[in-house]
Interface confidence: low
């Protein structure tokens, strides 16, 4: 039988009574075209809904949008257009919303031809009122919040201006002109670049890449010959174009572009790129692409300083530029990541990683599962998981793989059974471990979203026909039941639920469909009285993570320490509750080599945890440019892995000199830049 | 209550064999890891021996290494440690004791009362 | 291997007082697997401390155990008469699996 419906399975009792009770439904008053949403604040309810319909008329386009709010999480809708002069809202630009619970909205509208400038609504009272400010520029793109201060707003324009408000969008200044790319950092710091000759596509390897810390009174040039920029975690990254020849090299600085490094990477052609997979403020996850369209390419991870980098992964899923990888951070268990790498035989087979890029494996196969139509060998097989590249082939594949930092070991993705992904309709998969183990969840595909940090799973099947059915599941995924939430069928778009997975509120989008007219209609259920109760202590187990052979005493050492969770038991239906936070204890753990990545000039082997050097530097001097001085690298081949806790066990030595050498590898040396004030 | 009972400590010529047995109650034997710890007349406590729950794997103090012994059986709750090749050295009180749950180490929690090791010709 | 040291080899002091004793190792130990024990004549020893800070089931709060790296210090914040015994710090290493200090008797002044 299908998982969850066989006798094992306890029903939730009189669910039916309880969710209709708790199932509101609203229709829009409006002709179907889009819609998005977005989540004022956070635990607010508040929820802001655009839809627009556009009219192709013979010399133009008609526009016409309808702004509505809710303060109930999706129960309630109140159309509040008027609050924004029945004005025609941009979509491209989306709903600006500002940082943590500022309650600060932005909406750009459309304004006609000849004006000389654009046009934003802004609210700073979670859209209870917008105040409407005419632009001293057209905007190219959304308005950007500082992460530090929601009042301090930058955009670029269509001629490629700077522009910097500091008082939430009220007045702007353009602080820079010729600007190709800006990005909030930390402390209120703008890093943006600039062309100097023709226009950003043609300057591309020749721009510069400039710091303003004041909004723009004073700037500082911090590297030359850029071709692109990227922030990530506390690493400021810029791809060079080398002296000689097309080639370009990754540089790195930890502070804010005073000095750099150039990273330990690969340099890559013209048409090759790089890109930042993930980045916190211990490592980053690099991807390089191989030479030619090969699709793919290679995984480095880098040390503490985003300097020297390890080789994590080969035949790396990326295609071209700004194209599809599956790589995905799983949130719900620390270290843990899942990607996608293209085999010889041009097969697509999914990895996962427990140990941060450490080691990658194949996922295991389900208990439940049989090996399909791409195995050799039908009893030995892996899971093989569908994400980006997947849905961007259009497979029949909703969603991507989904975990929350909240619901402890909870990951759940779409998938086969065999030595590769497979294009046949693929079935749902859930691991409650962190993706050391998986089980079939449902038959087939659906949209799932996770609802009370884990307490709640709710699940749509994946249909053309309209539908009026959810499934749901209050325990992690086993057992599943089903509610009928309108007689009407509809055609389902989508599921929203509160970022975060705190909320017990989902909400159902789509249209209905009559001979003559289509309308938007939701319909938002509570799961509140399914769990009547609050969990208390009892409802709560001790479980180890990492957890992979309980006789040893390292047992769920990852990165040099362990975590033992309380997590719901699957057999208790109660509310973990919106203030629920995950409780966790860690115990360090004894160093062993797999604390420690192989250093500049080593590698490790397969299949062995010893660091060996690499045989083309056997007997040379380990020399490496560090902030401009050459520096001299004495070593047994191994660094402590960025964010890795271990004491004691194990302890390789390790030296660096400064060899009193400049080196500037033709980037610009600290005492190169120049800074000039407005 | 949980509990640990020592026995068969006595008196043995040095070259000599014994076979020390450990009951344990009211805990799941198999989930814990067991040991053998003894301490010499007037002196410290020092290590002997480690096996894991399932008797998969098993450790030895250097000073024991191939001529002790340890196991288990999990049917019957039982600790054993067969002592061969004895030395004077090797007279102690040896305690059997509780080791970590599972996934953590949280000391040797649970002690017996001890067995009497006497190695003399 | 790591050698505990622990110091004094004997701490004189009235019932009331505060009693620091210390265990050193010779090299680093993780906090998690160090343990505190109390050992009284003819009776088996006792589990205080584990993971170098954490009160194991039943044991009073005058007893607290604090330290990571190489130093580790049990504190009895004033002293009863029943806690005149000999303590002995603990670790769990790669080599031998455990190891011992050589123990600190705690006796009345």
């Known amino acids: 039988s299908a998982p969850g419906e066989d006798e094992e399975c306890g029903r939730v009792r009189d669910f039916v009574a309880k969710l209709a009770n708790n199932t509101h439904q609203h229709v829009f008053d409006d002709l179907r075209g889009s819609v998005s949403l977005s989540w004022v604040g956070d635990s607010t309810g508040v929820i802001l809904v655009l839809t627009t319909f556009h009219v192709p008329l013979v010399i133009m386009t008609f526009g016409q949008s309808k702004l509505y709010r809710s303060e109930d999480y999706g129960k309630n809708f109140k159309d509040i257009t008027d609050l924004i002069n029945n004005t025609f809202i941009r979509t491209e630009f989306g709903m600006a919303i500002g940082p943590e619970n500022s309650g600060k909205v932005v909406l750009t509208a459309e304004v006609s031809g000849g004006s000389r400038g654009g046009r934003i609504f802004r609210s700073s009272d979670f859209a209870k009122n917008f105040v409407q400010t005419d632009l001293p520029f057209h905007p190219l793109t959304q308005m950007m919040y500082s992460p530090q201060n929601s009042d301090y707003l930058l955009a670029l324009s269509t001629e490629n201006g700077l522009w910097v408000s500091k008082n939430f969008g009220g007045k702007w200044e353009e602080i820079h002109k010729a600007v190709c790319l800006a990005k909030w950092g930390s402390d209120n710091t703008i890093f943006f670049t600039t062309y100097a000759n023709g226009s950003c596509k043609a300057d591309l390897g020749a721009l510069e890449l400039w710091r303003t810390s004041d909004l723009g009174k004073s700037f500082k040039t911090i590297g030359v010959k850029i071709y692109s920029f990227g922030l990530g975690g506390r690493f400021l990254f810029a791809s060079v174009m080398a002296d000689k020849d097309t080639t370009r090299r990754i540089h790195v600085s930890t502070d804010q572009g005073d000095t750099w490094s150039m990273a330990q990477l690969p340099s890559v052609g013209q048409e090759q790129f790089y890109s930042i997979l993930a980045a916190n403020d211990d490592m980053v996850f690099m991807h390089v692409d191989e030479p030619g369209d090969t699709g793919f390419g290679t995984i480095f991870t880098s040390d503490d300083r985003g300097i020297v980098y390890s080789k994590s992964l080969d035949r790396h899923l990326y295609t071209t530029t700004g194209g599809e990888t599956d790589f995905t951070n799983v949130t719900s268990l620390r270290g843990v990541y899942i990607t996608s790498v293209l085999s010889e035989d041009n097969s697509i087979q999914t990895m996962i990683t427990f140990d941060q890029g450490g080691r990658w494996t194949h996922l295991r196969k389900p208990e439940n599962s049989e090996c399909d139509a791409t195995a050799k060998n039908k009893n030995e097989c892996s899971l093989h998981i569908h994400a980006s590249y997947s849905i961007s082939q259009k497979l029949n594949v909703p969603m991507a793989p989904l975990s929350e930092p909240n619901a402890v070991g909870i990951v759940i993705a779409h998938g086969s059974v065999g030595d590769a992904i497979s294009v046949m309709v693929p079935d749902v998969y859930i691991s409650d471990d962190g993706g050391y183990s998986w089980t079939k969840m449902l038959e087939g595909p659906h949209y799932y979203t996770i609802l009370d940090s884990g307490g709640i799973i709710v699940a749509i099947e994946h249909s053309s026909r309209p539908i009026n059915v959810i499934k749901f599941s209050t325990d992690e995924g086993q057992c599943w039941q089903t509610y009928t939430f309108t007689r009407d069928p509809i055609y389902f778009t989508g599921l929203a639920s509160e970022p975060g997975a705190r909320s017990m509120n989902i909400s159902i989008w789509g249209f209905t469909e009559s001979f003559l007219t289509s309308q938007w209609v939701s319909y938002t259920i509570d799961f509140k009285d399914i769990l009547e109760r609050n969990c208390e202590e009892k409802d709560y187990t001790i479980w180890l993570a990492h957890s992979t052979d309980p006789e040893d005493y390292e047992d769920g050492c990852i990165l040099g320490y362990k975590e033992q969770f309380l997590r719901l038991r699957k057999s208790s239906v109660c509310q973990n509750g919106r203030d629920y936070v995950v409780t966790k204890q860690p115990s360090i753990c004894l160093c062993s080599l797999e604390d420690f990545l192989c250093d500049f000039g080593y590698y490790r082997p397969e299949n062995d945890s010893k660091c060996v050097e690499q045989p083309e530097l056997k007997g040379h001097d380990l020399e490496f440019c560090l902030y401009g001085r050459e520096e001299h690298l004495t070593t047994n081949g191994y660094r402590k892995i960025p964010g890795d806790k271990c004491q004691g066990g194990v302890n390789p030595v390790r030296e660096v000199k400064d060899l009193k050498k400049k080196c500037t590898s033709n980037f610009l040396s600290p005492e190169k830049q120049n800074s000039k004030s407005n | 209550e949980v509990q640990l009972l020592e026995s068969g400590g006595g008196l043995v010529q040095p070259g000599g064999s014994l076979r020390l047995s450990c009951a344990a109650s009211?805990?799941?034997?198999?989930?814990?890891?067991m040991n053998w710890v003894r301490q010499a007349p007037g002196k410290g406590l020092e290590w002997v021996s480690a096996?894991?729950?399932?008797?998969?794997?098993?450790y030895y103090a250097d000073s024991v290494k191939g001529r002790f012994t340890i196991s288990r059986d999990n049917s019957k709750n039982t600790l054993y440690l067969q002592m061969s090749s004895l030395r004077a050295e090797d007279t102690a009180v040896y305690y059997c004791?509780?080791?970590?749950?599972?996934?953590?180490?949280?000391?040797?929690?649970?002690w017996g009362q001890g067995t009497t090791v006497t190695v003399s010709s | 291997e790591i050698v505990l040291t622990q110091s004094p080899g004997t701490l004189s002091l009235s019932p009331g007082e505060r009693a620091t004793l210390s265990c050193r190792a010779s090299?680093?130990?993780?906090?998690?697997?160090l343990a505190w024990y109390q050992q009284k004549p003819g009776q088996a020893p006792r589990l205080l401390i584990y993971?170098?800070?954490s009160r194991a089931t039943g044991i009073p709060d005058r007893f607290s155990g604090s330290g990571s790296g190489t130093d580790f210090t049990l504190t009895i914040s004033r002293l009863e008469p029943e806690d005149f015994a000999v303590y002995y710090c603990?670790?769990?290493?790669?080599?031998?699996?455990?190891?011992f200090g050589q123990g600190t008797k705690l006796e009345i002044k």
């Open positions: 009211g805990f799941t034997f198999s989930s814990y890891a």
């Open positions: 603990q670790q769990y290493g790669s080599s031998p699996m455990y190891t």
């Open positions: 004791t509780r080791g970590r749950g599972i996934g953590y180490y949280n000391g040797m929690d649970v």
């Open positions: 090299q680093s130990v993780s906090s998690s697997y």
């Open positions: 993971g170098a800070s």
């Open positions: 096996i894991s729950g399932s008797g998969g794997s098993t």
